[in-house]
């Protein structure tokens, strides 16, 4: 006769693991007991269960509780065990010694493999800003056994780096991701993708990426100097810019304060029935965290009743 | 046949000693581990010691533990219990058992001798 | 400590009667289970070991059965020898441990 096993029994953490060991042997052999051992290279050789023909299971105290047989229906020629919710200090050799009637004494060794699926972690670098050179944009660490792989999904043009630090059981991957800051990044996806043969399918963490950046300030309304009369109701200066984080804005007028009855709101300045009184030079102060943005333009109210043209100057300041 | 024959008992003071014997015949003695077994008077069985056959390895209840010394002399084909310091609850027939197979988690006592009365009193 | 409960403590029976007697183990022992006989004045005998294979020499109309925690020893009819105290006996760890004992006695 002879012993059926295998060479390596993989399972991921958690699971049972089933140890075979089979007898096949020739008929009116039968097995009187199956002995399984850790015999881990360097150290004695540890008891783990003894299957006998009568007695049933014996499991040594260590291992109390976590050794099984399998389900009926049961071949009394099959000695394999299962080992309950393996760790990762499970992984290494194990020996089964078939003790059988004629034919004597038989043993195998089998290597048990405990798959440590990762945890990954996904953490941000510092606050990208336009105008930076290369910059973290995140750096994303697996851990597990063996070593994972870990890699980005990214429509974001970039540069990756990798390293590894090995631990007595399992390796720990960082991968960095890095870039050059711009608006159009803004929003845009960064995923850490991480697979190891102890995931179904591989693990994905997004991050979204917020590049701060502020754009030049415009202000709209004085397309059309004919428009600007006395007399004329709901004139209104428009101050235009965009910028993460969102701006504020802030009118004022350069040549003294704003005249009475107008209006702000946010970006757009509001005027009363214009009168001369409303000529002048405005300013839009647009400004978020990161920088500040300025633009003026000059109004100059025209009087119908007068021939001469009306002037109007846009400056824009940054 | 296979006869197992303990000795070595009797009236003792607390605090005092005894050494009992248990003379095997009729089977290859060296092959197999021996236990001592205890019965209070008019109570259940207790088990109180083992050894194994190399002589190498031994185990004891708790309640002796660091009193009784197990020993045996193949040569002899004899097995003694040496106990110490000893206390009124362990007066009790002492029985010597041979245990089926030589294993650490015992296996049956499938012969037993006929036992020896230690009192221990004042 | 494996700990080892029969049921009954005693019983009374007559000769003929099917006799059943109980014991629990306090945590799953497999079938490392024996029974033993002991009467009045003598030494344990043993009746069943692995908790339901017959000792040689001993009366088939003893049997025992169980596995795991829970197991039973059957005397299909009694006789008047049969009269005596029963221990179950675990020996899965050490310490091995006895039951309290079942006494049967005559009706």
């Known amino acids: 006769g002879e012993l059926e096993t295998s060479d390596v029994v993989t399972v991921v953490l958690g699971q049972d693991a089933k140890l075979p060991c089979f007898y096949r042997g020739d008929s009116g052999e039968q097995v009187g007991q199956v002995a399984w051992a850790r015999v881990d290279a360097g150290e004695g050789a540890q008891e783990l269960a003894l299957l006998h023909s009568k007695y049933g299971l014996h499991v040594s105290p260590a291992y109390e509780g976590r050794v099984e047989q399998p389900p009926p229906p049961r071949n009394p020629l099959d000695g394999s065990v299962l080992l309950r919710n393996a760790v990762q200090a499970d992984e290494g050799e194990y020996e089964c010694r078939v003790s059988t009637f004629p034919a004597g004494s038989f043993q195998a060794r089998l290597r048990l493999r405990v798959l440590v699926p990762p945890l990954p972690s996904l953490n941000p670098g510092p606050a990208l800003e336009e105008g930076q050179g290369l910059t973290l944009a995140a750096s994303c660490t697996a851990e597990g056994s063996p070593a994972p792989s870990v890699t980005w999904d990214t429509e974001v043009k970039g540069t990756t780096s990798s390293r590894s630090f090995k631990h007595s059981r399992s390796a720990a991957v960082t991968s960095e991701f890095h870039l050059v800051p711009s608006r159009s990044m803004n929003g845009q996806p960064l995923t850490c993708v991480v697979s190891h043969p102890g995931l179904l399918q591989d693990q994905r963490i997004t991050h979204i990426l917020h590049v701060s950046f502020l754009a030049e300030a415009s202000v709209r309304g004085l397309e059309d100097q004919n428009l600007w009369h006395i007399g004329r109701e709901g004139a209104m200066l428009k101050c235009l810019s965009e910028g993460q984080p969102p701006p504020s804005y802030n009118w004022t007028r350069l040549d003294g304060p704003l005249p009475s009855g107008v209006r702000v709101d946010g970006d757009t300045l509001g005027f009363p029935p214009l009168t001369t009184e409303h000529s002048g030079i405005y300013v839009c102060h647009v400004s978020n965290e990161f920088s500040s943005r300025d633009s003026q333009v000059t109004v100059d109210v025209l009087d119908p009743q007068e021939d001469s043209g009306k002037q109007v100057d846009l400056v824009s300041a940054s | 046949e296979v006869q197992l024959v303990e000795s070595g008992g009797g009236l003792v003071q607390p605090g005092g000693s005894l050494r009992l014997s248990c003379a095997a015949s009729g089977f290859n003695f060296g092959d197999f581990a021996m236990s001592w077994v205890r019965q209070a008077p008019g109570k259940g069985l207790e088990w109180v010691s083992r050894i194994y056959s190399g002589d190498d390895n031994a185990s004891y209840a708790d309640s002796v533990k660091g009193r009784f010394t197990i020993s045996r002399d193949n040569s002899k084909n004899t097995l003694y219990l040496q106990m110490n310091s000893l206390r009124a609850e362990d007066t009790a027939v002492y029985y010597c058992?041979?245990?089926?197979?030589?294993?650490?988690?015992?296996?049956?006592?499938?012969?037993w001798g006929q036992g020896t009365l230690v009192t221990v009193s004042s | 400590d494996i700990q080892m409960t029969q049921s009954p403590s005693s019983l009374s029976a007559s000769v003929g009667d099917r006799v059943t007697i109980t014991c629990r183990a306090s945590?799953?022992?497999?079938?490392?289970l024996a029974w033993y006989q002991q009467k009045p004045g003598k030494a344990p005998k043993l009746l069943i070991y692995a908790a339901s294979s017959l000792q040689s020499g001993v009366p088939s109309r003893f049997s025992g059965s169980g596995s795991g925690t829970d197991f039973t020893l059957t005397i299909s009819s009694l006789q008047p020898e049969d009269f005596a105290t029963y221990y179950c006996q675990q020996h899965y760890t050490t310490p091995p441990t006895f039951g309290q004992g079942t006494k049967v006695e005559i009706k």
């Open positions: 058992a041979r245990q089926t197979e030589d294993r650490s988690y015992g296996y049956d006592l499938d012969y």
């Open positions: 945590q799953g022992i497999s079938s490392y």
